[in-house]
C-alpha cells in the first residue's frame, strides 16, 4: 500500500539501485517513485565535512521484502516511493531552492529580472530541465541577474553545491505550465532519423509516447510495429531528441509510427501509467510471482497491488487454468518494460497501474457489493466515501452530501455553499449511517480550504463542483475511505451499475432522512435528457440518471453527494448530485455534475495545494 512517512536521521542499508543528486528529500522521493524498481530511498541532507560530495545524495533502493535494515545517520532522511499513492503521484515540482547551485550542462545564459522569469524561461525551453539564477548580490558581477538553463542525462543535477545569492529550481513543464504547446500528431508509416537517447520495448505507439513524455530527455519518438522487417527492432520504441528540439522531417517508412512527447502539453498530459490490456500478447520479463485469478482485469489489479510488479501475463491455456482461475504471472524488468513482446498466445498482458494518479489509488479499490426517492436503507460501511455536510449556526443541520476522494479531500457540489461560503460554520461527518447517531462527541472534520469552481454561478447550473480541503487528514477505516475518481478518458465509458446515495428528501415536499438511503438508477444519454429538459441546457459537463417512469431519484438534501458506478470491479465517482425538476417525476431525470469532465480541475487544485501540504508536513 501507500506509505508516505519520512524517517529522519535514518538511512536504509543496501538494496542500491542508483545514486543521483536532488535538492531535498521530496524530490528524491519523486525520483524514486518514477524509477521502475525503486521502492525505498535515503537522502543525505547533512553530511560530515569529509563527505561533502555525498551531501544532497539521493540513494534509490529496492528490496524483495519491501523493506531494508535501517541505520541511524544524522542528517539522513529516508522513506518509501509513492508508487500506489494515487493523488500524490506527480512529476511536478514547484519548489525554489535559495542558496543552492544545481549543476549540470549550462546550455543557455540569459539576463532576467527575477527568479520567476528564469523559471518561466526554463519551462518554455525544450531542453531545460533545471536552472540556476544569480541574484543582483552574487559575488561575480558578470553573472548577476543571469539565468542559467541546464540539463543532464538523468534530468537531475550532476552535483549540488551551497552558494550564496544563487537560486535553483526545476522546469515546470511537468506541471502542465509550458507555453510551448504540444503537437498531438501521430505519423503513421513515418520515422524520425534524429538522435536516439534510449530505447524500450512497448506494445504500441501510445505506450511509447507516454514513456517518452516521462523520460527526461525524450522530445519525440519512433515506434516500430510487430510487422517491421528487422526482427530485433519489432516493438521497439526509440526515444529521441535533437538540438533544435524539433524532429527532422519524418522519413516514409512502412510499419513505423512517430510522434512527440506530451511533456509540453497544457491539458492533454498522459498519466504515468498504461491501463490498456493487450489480448493475445505476451510480455516477457523476470517472473516475480504466480497466482490464479478470474480475468485479466483481476490479474492487472493483483499486479497493481503487488508493488514490485511492473507488468503481467494472464494465460488462458487449459493447462494454466484451475478451479479458482487461470494463471496470472506477475513480472518485472530493469527498465519497467517487457524484455520481449510476442503475439498469438492464449491470454492477455498489461501493465501495473501503480503509477496511475487517480484511477487506481489502491485505497479506493474497495469491492463493495452493492432518500433518495424510491430508495432503501443503506448499511454501515456500504458507501464508505459518503459524508454529511452540516451547517452549525444556532443548531446543526444536514445540508448536503459529499464524497471522500483523499485523506484531506472531499468533493461536493458548489451550490451547497450558496449563501454560506464560510468554512468555519461547516462540519463534515464520515463513517456514519444515521444522522441521529451524531452527538457533541462525534468526531467531525473542519474545512481548511473551500475551493468552489471559479466559473460557478448561483442558479445557473454549470460548474457545480467544489473541493473541500480538510484541516486534518482522515483516518481510513472500514466505514470511512475514499472513492476512486474516473480518468479524463472515462468521459465516454458506458456504465450499467450506478447508485445514488444520500440523506435527502424521500418525496418532493419531504424532509431529511435519518438513515442513509441508496437507490440504483440507470444513466440517461445527454441527448435524451435534453429532450426532457427543454427549458435547460444539458451540457457535456452534466450527466443524467433516472427511470423513464420516475419513482427513483435524488432529491433536496442529496446535493453534493455521489453518483457511483461499478466498472471493471471497482466503484468510481461518476457524478455529483446537482439538480432536478421535482424528485422522481416521470421523464424528469436527476442531473449530476460529470466528474470525468473536471479531472484537470480536480488535479490542479489538489496538487497545487498538496505540494504546499507536503512541504509543511515534512519540514
Amino acid at each position: 500500500g501507500c506509505m508516505t512517512q519520512l524517517y529522519k536521521n535514518t538511512f536504509f542499508r543496501g538494496g542500491d539501485l542508483a545514486a543521483i543528486y536532488t535538492p531535498d528529500a521530496q524530490y528524491c522521493q519523486k525520483m524514486c517513485t518514477f524509477h521502475p524498481r525503486c521502492l525505498l530511498f535515503s537522502f543525505l541532507a547533512v553530511t560530515p565535512p569529509k563527505e561533502t560530495n555525498k551531501r544532497f545524495g539521493c540513494f534509490m533502493k529496492e528490496s524483495i521484502t519491501g523493506t531494508l535494515p535501517r541505520i541511524h545517520r544524522t542528517g539522513a532522511i529516508s522513506g518509501h516511493s509513492l508508487k500506489q499513492c494515487g493523488h500524490q503521484i506527480s512529476a511536478c515540482h514547484r519548489d525554489i531552492y535559495k542558496g543552492l547551485d544545481m549543476r549540470g550542462s549550462n546550455f543557455n545564459i540569459s539576463k532576467t529580472d527575477n527568479i520567476e522569469e528564469c523559471q518561466k524561461l526554463c519551462t518554455n525551453n525544450f531542453h531545460c530541465q533545471f536552472f540556476t539564477y544569480a541574484t543582483s548580490a552574487f559575488y561575480r558581477p558578470e553573472y548577476r541577474k543571469k539565468c542559467l538553463l541546464k540539463h543532464s542525462a538523468s534530468g537531475t543535477p550532476t552535483s549540488i553545491k551551497s552558494a550564496d545569492n544563487l537560486v535553483s529550481g526545476f522546469s515546470l513543464k511537468s506541471c502542465a505550465l509550458s507555453e510551448i504547446g504540444c503537437p498531438m500528431d501521430i505519423f503513421q508509416h513515418s520515422a524520425f532519423a534524429d538522435l536516439n537517447v534510449s530505447q524500450v520495448i512497448t506494445p504500441d505507439a501510445f505506450v511509447c509516447r507516454t514513456i517518452c513524455t516521462f523520460h527526461p530527455n525524450c522530445l519525440f519518438f519512433t515506434f516500430y510495429t510487430n510487422e517491421w522487417e528487422t526482427e530485433s527492432q519489432r516493438n521497439v520504441c526509440f526515444l529521441k531528441t535533437s538540438k533544435s528540439g524539433r524532429p527532422s522531417p519524418p522519413i516514409p517508412q512502412e510499419n513505423a509510427i512517430s510522434g512527440y512527447s506530451l511533456l509540453t502539453c497544457r491539458k492533454t498530459r498522459p498519466e504515468p501509467c498504461h491501463s490498456k490490456i493487450y489480448s493475445g500478447v505476451d510480455f516477457e520479463g523476470e517472473e516475480l510471482n504466480v497466482t490464479f485469478v478470474q480475468g485479466a482485469d483481476v490479474c492487472q489489479e493483483t499486479c497493481t497491488k503487488t508493488i514490485r510488479c511492473q507488468f503481467f501475463i494472464y494465460s488462458l491455456l487449459p493447462q494454466d487454468c484451475k478451479e479458482e482461475g487461470c494463471k496470472c504471472s506477475l513480472r518485472l524488468s530493469t527498465d519497467g518494460s517487457p524484455t520481449r513482446i510476442t503475439y498469438g498466445m492464449q491470454g492477455s498482458s498489461g501493465y501495473s497501474l501503480r503509477l496511475c494518479k487517480l484511477v487506481d489509488s489502491p485505497d479506493c479499490t474497495t469491492k463493495i457489493n452493492a432518500r433518495i426517492v424510491g430508495g432503501t436503507n443503506a448499511s454501515l460501511g456500504e458507501w464508505p466515501w459518503q459524508v454529511s455536510l452540516q451547517v452549525k449556526l444556532v443548531s446543526q443541520t444536514h445540508l448536503c452530501g459529499g464524497s471522500i476522494i483523499g485523506r484531506q479531500w472531499v468533493l461536493t457540489a458548489a451550490h451547497c455553499f450558496d449563501g454560506i461560503p464560510y468554512p468555519d460554520v461547516w462540519r463534515i461527518y464520515g463513517g456514519i449511517l444515521s444522522l441521529s447517531e451524531i452527538t457533541k462527541e462525534t468526531p467531525s472534520s473542519r474545512i481548511k480550504e473551500l475551493i468552489i469552481h471559479q466559473e460557478y454561478k448561483v442558479s445557473e447550473g454549470n460548474y457545480d463542483i467544489a473541493l473541500i480541503k480538510l484541516q486534518t487528514p482522515l483516518n481510513y477505516t472500514e466505514f470511512q475511505k475514499p472513492i476512486c475518481l474516473p480518468s479524463k478518458a472515462d468521459t465516454n465509458t458506458i456504465y450499467t451499475n450506478c447508485w445514488v446515495t444520500g440523506w435527502g428528501y424521500t418525496k418532493e415536499q419531504g424532509e431529511t432522512q435519518n438513515i442513509l438511503q441508496k437507490a440504483t438508477i440507470p444513466l440517461v444519454p445527454n441527448e435524451e435528457c435534453q429532450k426532457k429538459y427543454r427549458d435547460y441546457v444539458i451540457n457535456k459537463q452534466m450527466i443524467c440518471a433516472g427511470y423513464k417512469e420516475g419513482g427513483t431519484d435524488a432529491c433536496k438534501g442529496d446535493s453534493g453527494g455521489p453518483l457511483v458506478c461499478k466498472h471493471s470491479g471497482r466503484w468510481q465517482l461518476v457524478g455529483i448530485t446537482s439538480w432536478g425538476e421535482g424528485c422522481g417525476r416521470k421523464d424528469q431525470p436527476g442531473v449530476y455534475t460529470k466528474v470525468s469532465e473536471y479531472m484537470d480541475w480536480i488535479l490542479e487544485k489538489t496538487q497545487s495545494s498538496d505540494v504546499r501540504a507536503l512541504e509543511t508536513s515534512s519540514a
Partner: antibody, heavy 128, light 109 residues
C-alpha cells in the same frame, strides 16, 4: 426587507430611447434572476424580459426583441432596461420583479417560475 | 405558445362570501402556476406559487389547487381588502418566458 425601486420613466417620442433602472436591496441581488414586467393603462400584465443572476443569459418577449436590452450590475445591485425604437404601444407602467424559484426545483440550476417581489413601477409614455 | 384564460372576467361578491376563481392553460403546465393580487395603483403581489403553496405573509384564507391545465384560487371568506384584480401566471417553455392570464376582477356587490 426586500425592496425594488424603479426609476427612469417619463415621456418620450416614438423612435426615441429610454433607460430604466431598478435599485435592489434587502437580499443577495447576484443570486436571483430578475425581470421586467409591464402593464399598459387599464390592461393586464405582460412579461418583457428576464436576466440570469450573472447576467450571462437573457430572454425577451417577442414584442420587444431587438429593441430592448436587459442588463444588470451586481456590484451596484441594479437592474437596467435599455429601450430603443420606442413605439406608442410600449406605453405602460414598467415593473421590476425578482424571479422566484419553484419549491419543486432543487439544486444548482434554478429557473425562475414566478415573481415573488415587485417594485412600485415607473411610467413610460411614448407619444408625439 | 401556451395561452391562459381566466373566468369569470368579473366576480361580484360581498365581504364574508367565498370566492372561486378559475384559470385554464391551453396545455399542461404541471404544477407551475402562480396567482397574484393587484389593487388599483399598486404593484402585483404574489399570493400562491406551485399551484397550491402560499407565499410568505399571505393569509390562510387564500388557497390554490389544481394541476395540469385547470387551476383554482379560493378565498374562503372575503375581507374588504381582498377586492382587487387577480392574475394567474405560468412559466411556459423557458425560451418563451412567462404568460399571464387576462385577470379576474373581484368587486363588491
Amino acid at each position: 426587507e426586500v425592496q425594488l425601486l424603479e426609476s427612469g420613466g417619463g415621456l418620450v417620442q416614438p423612435g426615441g430611447s429610454l433607460r430604466l433602472s431598478c435599485a435592489a436591496s434587502g437580499f443577495t441581488f447576484s443570486y436571483y434572476h430578475m425581470s421586467w414586467v409591464r402593464q399598459a393603462p387599464g390592461k393586464g400584465l405582460e412579461w418583457v424580459s428576464v436576466i440570469s443572476p450573472s447576467g450571462g443569459s437573457t430572454k425577451y418577449a417577442d414584442s420587444v426583441k431587438g429593441r430592448f436590452t436587459i442588463s444588470r450590475d451586481n456590484s451596484k445591485n441594479t437592474l437596467y432596461l435599455q429601450m430603443n425604437s420606442l413605439r406608442a404601444e410600449d406605453t405602460a407602467v414598467y415593473y421590476c420583479a425578482r424571479g422566484g424559484s419553484s419549491d419543486y426545483a432543487w439544486g444548482s440550476y434554478r429557473r425562475p417560475y414566478y415573481f415573488d417581489y415587485w417594485g412600485q413601477g415607473t411610467l413610460v409614455t411614448v407619444s408625439s | 405558445d401556451i395561452q391562459m384564460t381566466q373566468s369569470p372576467a368579473t366576480l361580484s361578491l360581498s365581504p364574508g362570501e367565498r370566492a372561486t376563481l378559475s384559470c385554464r392553460a391551453s396545455q399542461s403546465v404541471s404544477s407551475y402556476l402562480a396567482w397574484y393580487q393587484q389593487k388599483p395603483g399598486q404593484a402585483p403581489r404574489l399570493l400562491i406559487y406551485d399551484a397550491s403553496n402560499r407565499a410568505t405573509g399571505i393569509p390562510a384564507r387564500f388557497s390554490g389547487s389544481g394541476s395540469g391545465t385547470d387551476f383554482t384560487l379560493t378565498i374562503s371568506s372575503l375581507e374588504p381588502e381582498d377586492f382587487a384584480v387577480y392574475y394567474c401566471q405560468q412559466r411556459s417553455n423557458w425560451p418563451r418566458g412567462f404568460t399571464f392570464g387576462p385577470g379576474t376582477k373581484v368587486d363588491i356587490k
